[in-house]
Interface confidence: low
């Protein structure tokens, strides 16, 4: 019956030695629950055997229960096929009929799922992506599958998670599980180390040119890990880049163009899952002046018997701040003319007739003269005087 009596009768001896029958004590205990009620909310864990490809259902109960329909060993139902239902009735001496009928909705095989690292290599320094992939088909209803991730104190109920704004070179642990009809059937843990981050910016100590063809840059390296440096130097539209050893903190630039502004950029980089370039530190300098190159295509042409027109083309390399053309005219070793113009266009008049002259044209850039271009030319005899004399005859 639902309630039962527990009656006891005790006989004791009185001091006089006569027997005394004591009163009978009657106790009423509460009724037992039904096994259906007691195990209404029972939970099950599914354990997969990779060799047999069969599941074991572990019943989460505190006592050893009795199973009908299937055999239970240590509260476990063995040899269950994936995606097939099995029925087990659960009873125990602490509960009454009706038994709990538990439908075991067996999940798909564990090896049909794979936890995949879906992190983009370009973003692997600050992001982690994890995704469950179905790598084989199964007959279970996919609507009944749910996924759960826990990374630190963050919980996600998604098949795929993306963690962002992480620290480079840090280890992060993510635990994940897959549930079928809210019963866990597989789990996985991944410890992922974020990739090396972009190196910091080098600190340029100085960057200068002390000569026409040379410059120097010195720096302190960035704090974070890096493999090497890239130094680029840009003049006008030309750009040259060099790969520099990680241990360098100074570089001498050679074969530079005089009186030219160079913009330098220096960044560290690391070859990680991809090459990551750090921020570039920038500086600039202008190289010192140097002698300009020679003027070219110099011509000397006569405009009259004793006048010359001297022209030349600008030097290929000015190498300095200013632009001035000089013409020196010598007769013998005597300097007879010394002219300076903005353009290389000189009209030399009133020279001696029938005289050999040396014409030296050169460019001056404000700091240095260039190599002169030298041409020799003679004036004619005075044709007017000659004609006049002839007429008298």
């Amino acid at each position: 019956s639902d309630a039962y009596l527990n009656a006891s009768e005790t006989t004791t001896l009185s001091p006089s030695g006569s027997a005394v029958i004591s009163t009978t004590t009657i106790a009423t205990t509460p009724s037992k629950p039904t096994c259906d009620e007691k195990y209404a909310n029972i939970t099950v864990d599914y354990l997969y055997n990779k060799e047999t490809k069969l599941f074991t259902a572990k019943l989460n109960v505190n006592e050893n229960v009795e199973c009908g329909n299937n055999t239970c060993t240590n509260n476990e139902v063995h040899n269950l096929t994936e995606c097939k239902n099995a029925s087990v009735s659960i009873s125990h001496n602490s509960c009454t009929a009706p038994d709990k009928t538990l439908i075991l909705d067996v999940p798909p095989g564990v090896e049909k799922f794979q936890l995949h690292d879906c992190t983009q290599v370009e973003k692997a320094d600050t992001t982690i992506c994890l995704k469950w992939k179905n790598i084989e088909t199964f007959t279970c209803d996919t609507q009944n599958i749910t996924y759960r991730f826990q990374c630190g104190n963050m919980i996600f109920d998604n098949k795929e998670i993306k963690l962002e704004n992480l620290e480079p070179e840090h280890e992060y642990k993510c635990d994940s599980e897959i549930l079928y009809n809210n019963h866990k059937f597989t789990n996985a843990s991944k410890i992922i180390k974020t990739d090396f981050g972009s190196p910091g910016e080098p600190q340029i100590i100085f960057c200068r040119s002390e000569a026409a063809h040379q410059g120097v840059i010195t720096w302190n390296p960035p704090q974070r890990s890096f493999h090497n440096f890239t130094l680029c130097y840009i003049k006008e539209t030309e750009k040259d880049c060099l790969n520099l050893d990680k241990n360098l903190i100074k570089y001498d630039l050679q074969n530079l163009k005089p009186y030219t502004k160079y913009v330098l950029s220096l960044h560290a980089y690391i070859i990680a899952k991809v090459q990551r370039n750090g921020s570039a530190a920038m500086c600039h300098f202008t190289t010192k002046s140097a002698p300009p190159s020679q003027v070219w295509n110099m011509t000397v042409s006569m405009t009259s018997d004793n006048s010359m027109h001297v022209k030349c083309r600008p030097p290929r390399d000015r190498n300095g701040p200013h632009e001035r053309y000089h013409l020196e005219v010598e007769a013998g070793n005597t300097l007879v003319r010394n002219e300076s113009h903005k353009n290389c266009d000189f009209r030399v008049k009133d020279l001696q007739y029938s005289t050999d002259y040396t014409f030296k044209a050169y460019f001056h850039n404000g700091d240095y003269p260039g190599e002169p271009f030298i041409l020799h030319h003679s004036t004619s005899y005075n044709s007017k005087a000659h004609h006049h004399h002839h007429h008298h005859h």
Epitope: P221, D245, K246, N247, L248, I249, K250
Partner: nanobody, 123 residues
């Protein structure tokens, strides 16, 4: 096995100069980056300066930059540390070290160490 022997330490007044030398033997000197480290009483060993194999690259700790100059003479198997404008806080035992990898200021990258030479800056 590289042996290193420092010399040149001593007592100097504030503002004065000293030149430390470190002679190397027992290895190919030009295969090693060289560094100077120092340890003041009751303090940890700290990086001072380093120089690459060729001598083309040098590195200084912030506290000594502009006052100390490191150099090396591969023909003499010797590395030098010229110390100018010395201050009392520069007082320490100065150690010379050799590294086959030479990665600036990390003491763990230095395989060989000298016994040290004491520099005292005091008036």
């Amino acid at each position: 096995q590289v042996q290193l022997q420092e010399s040149g330490g001593g007592l100097v007044q504030p503002g004065g100069s000293l030149r430390l030398s470190c002679a190397a033997s027992g290895g190919t000197f030009s295969d090693y980056g060289m560094g100077w480290f120092r340890q003041a009483p009751g303090k940890e060993r700290e990086f001072v300066s380093s120089i690459s194999w060729s001598g083309n690259s040098v590195y200084y700790a912030g506290a000594v930059r502009g006052r100390f100059t490191i150099s090396r003479d591969n023909a003499k198997n010797t590395v030098y540390l010229q110390m100018n404008s010395l201050q009392p806080e520069d007082t320490a035992v100065y150690y010379c070290a050799a590294s086959s990898t030479w990665n600036n200021n990390d003491p763990t990258e230095y395989e060989y160490w000298g016994q040290g030479t004491l520099v005292t800056v005091s008036s």
